[in-house]
């Protein structure tokens, strides 16, 4: 190899200057006793190289690129050889930004997968390989004092979420959680969350059903629907409050919300609806009296209100 490039830094802030040096060894000067070293960034020739012969007979050219505005480019030094350029050496230059502080870090405890799933927004594009690590520790108090560290959680490439498995969690005890972003230009850390995994629990929704008609029960009035639901069994012992939403299947009506439902009601008579109309209904629940996340809405139940009411029945709720 006749030439060698060295650069002040192969990775710089986008728009920053970069200085490079290309040295041609003496034993290559048979190419030309006074070779003129040329510089090229990508496909473009770059003027401004300052060339000198060093005391050991090698030739050196130094160039300063005042602003590196490409996020990725190859810088090469070359000699004119006949009618073509002879590339002596090239280096890859990268330019970008240090990682912004990851923001909107939030977590939820999934009791089905027994894991704490945390997600965040990584911030603007850095144009550089940037790694994100979810870091955490156990804490007896309010996360001012750090207890046992928990194994780092590294998301798959391109993902902005990570799952901490149950074996690294302690329920009913606080954890300090934050995201660290790192690339060649720097490191940043999100603000720390301090949470008990159970306080971010997300339940599965109940399963909505139509109430089985019984001979002694009064049939629903016109404009009423009798509903029941089966709680999500693994969350049975968690106090919950729930809410229903409904809308007519036909037309453009938006969802109407009903709730909170009477605590522990597993059946409900919903009234004030249009008679002889098909409705779509869904239910969702949240841990009650303690923090938590709303469940997703349940699968839809489709029911039709009755045609007209028998005159002797009164509207009532089941508690």
């Amino acid at each position: 190899e006749c030439g060698h490039i060295s650069v002040s830094a192969p990775i710089v802030h986008l728009g920053d200057p970069i200085t490079a040096s290309c040295i041609i060894k003496q034993n290559c000067s048979h190419l030309d006793p006074e070779p003129q070293i040329l510089w090229r960034l990508g496909a473009e020739l770059q003027p401004g190289g300052r060339q000198q012969r060093l005391s050991d007979g090698t030739q050196e050219s130094i160039i300063t690129l005042p602003h590196l505005n490409h996020t990725q480019a190859f810088l090469s030094c070359a000699l004119n050889w006949g009618n073509s350029l002879q590339i002596l050496d090239q280096v890859e230059l990268r330019a970008g930004y240090p990682p912004a502080i990851p923001h909107n870090l939030s977590c939820l405890m999934n009791l089905t997968t027994s894991s704490l799933i945390c997600q965040w927004e990584p911030g603007p594009e850095t144009h550089l390989p940037t790694s994100f690590t979810l870091k955490s520790f156990k804490s007896r108090g309010n996360c001012q004092t750090q207890g046992d560290s928990i194994l780092d959680c590294v998301p798959k490439d391109g993902q902005s979420h990570c799952s901490i498995p149950r074996k690294h969690l302690l329920l009913y005890q606080n954890m300090g959680i934050w995201v660290q972003a790192e690339n060649a230009l720097g490191t940043s850390m999100s603000p720390q969350l301090c949470l008990d995994p159970m306080d971010v629990v997300k339940l599965e929704p109940p399963m909505l059903r139509t109430m089985d008609p019984s001979p002694e029960a009064a049939p629903p009035q016109a404009g009423c629907l009798q509903l029941s639901w089966e709680p999500w069994q693994p969350g049975l012992h968690i106090n919950q409050k729930c809410e229903l939403r409904h809308k007519p299947q036909r037309g453009e009506a938006s969802w109407a919300l009903v709730g909170p439902l009477p605590l522990e009601a597993l059946q409900y008579e919903l009234c004030g609806l249009l008679p002889a109309t098909a409705y779509t209904l869904q239910i969702r629940c949240i841990r009650w009296a303690l923090p938590g996340h709303w469940s997703d809405w349940s699968p839809s139940l489709e029911l039709r209100t009755t045609e007209r009411a028998p005159t002797h029945h009164h509207h009532h709720h089941h508690h």
Partner: antibody, heavy 118, light 107 residues
Framework: EVQLLESGGGLVQPGGSLRLSCAAS????????MGWVRQAPGKGLEWVSS????????PYADSVKGRFTISRDNSKNTLYLQMNSLRAEDTAVYYC???????????WGQGTLVTVSS | DIQMTQSPSSLSASVGDRVTITCRAS??????LNWYQQKPGKAPKLLIY???NLQNGVPSRFSGSGSGTDFTLTISSLQPEDFATYYC?????????FGGGTKVEIK
């Protein structure tokens, strides 16, 4: 300190009835599920019934369904188990326990012995 | 109903031994598995909840692991006060069910 104290056990003839009570203290009783677990002499543990915080949900073991009724009085911080149509196989120590959110029992009362015999 | 099968039903061990008790569920129960210790004439005491969470005040020599259908309670170094009967219990769905128990005796 959380404490649970059962009472009401004793000797009863087959077909008879008994009402067990469990007095709770040291925690907000009205926020927790409660349950009864029994243990026949020399045998393992068997869940009997549980009751939700407001009393609206009351699952039972098949072996006692239709004969036993669980209830609670949140104003008195007391859990009950009404046992009717008692059988010899209902003979056991009956424990009341507070249920954790994910269904574990902690703590337990000291237990009360129910003997069904003629 | 979910059946819980504990093994062994009894074991003999010495102080300082590492002891492992297993519990198998007849169907998947995620992490809804709890472990209890019971000494003769006493009420059971919760050791581990949700498969691996150590209850407050329980010595760290007790640990729980597993998920789905297979679970393990491990006592890393058996102490004289650990000789007792141990029960697993599933809380995934009602009826709540217990394993048959494992009696840990002095060798």
């Amino acid at each position: 300190e959380v404490q649970l104290l059962e009472s009401g056990g004793g000797l009863v003839q087959p077909g008879g009835s008994l009402r067990l009570s469990c007095a709770a203290s040291g925690f907000t009783f009205s926020l927790y599920w409660m349950g009864w677990v029994r243990q026949a002499p020399g045998k393992g543990l068997e869940w009997v019934s549980s009751i939700s915080s407001s009393g609206g949900v009351t699952p039972y073991a098949d072996s006692v369904k239709g004969r036993f009724t669980i209830s609670r009085d949140n104003s008195k911080n007391t859990l009950y188990l009404q046992m009717n149509s008692l059988r010899a196989e209902d003979t056991a120590v009956y424990y009341c326990a507070k249920l954790g959110e994910l269904g574990w029992f902690d703590p337990w009362g000291q237990g009360t012995l129910v003997t069904v015999s003629s | 109903d979910i059946q819980m099968t504990q093994s062994p039903s009894s074991l003999s061990a010495s102080v300082g031994d590492r002891v492992t008790i297993t519990c198998r569920a007849s169907q998947g129960i995620s992490s809804y598995l709890n472990w209890y210790q019971q000494k003769p004439g006493k009420a059971p005491k919760l050791l581990i909840y949700y498969a691996s969470n150590l209850q407050n005040g329980v010595p760290s020599r007790f640990s729980g692991s597993g998920s789905g259908t297979d679970f393990t309670l491990t006592i890393s170094s058996l102490q004289p006060e650990d000789f007792a009967t141990y029960y697993c219990q599933q809380s995934y769905s009602t009826p709540l069910t217990f394993g048959g128990g494992t009696k840990v005796e002095i060798k």
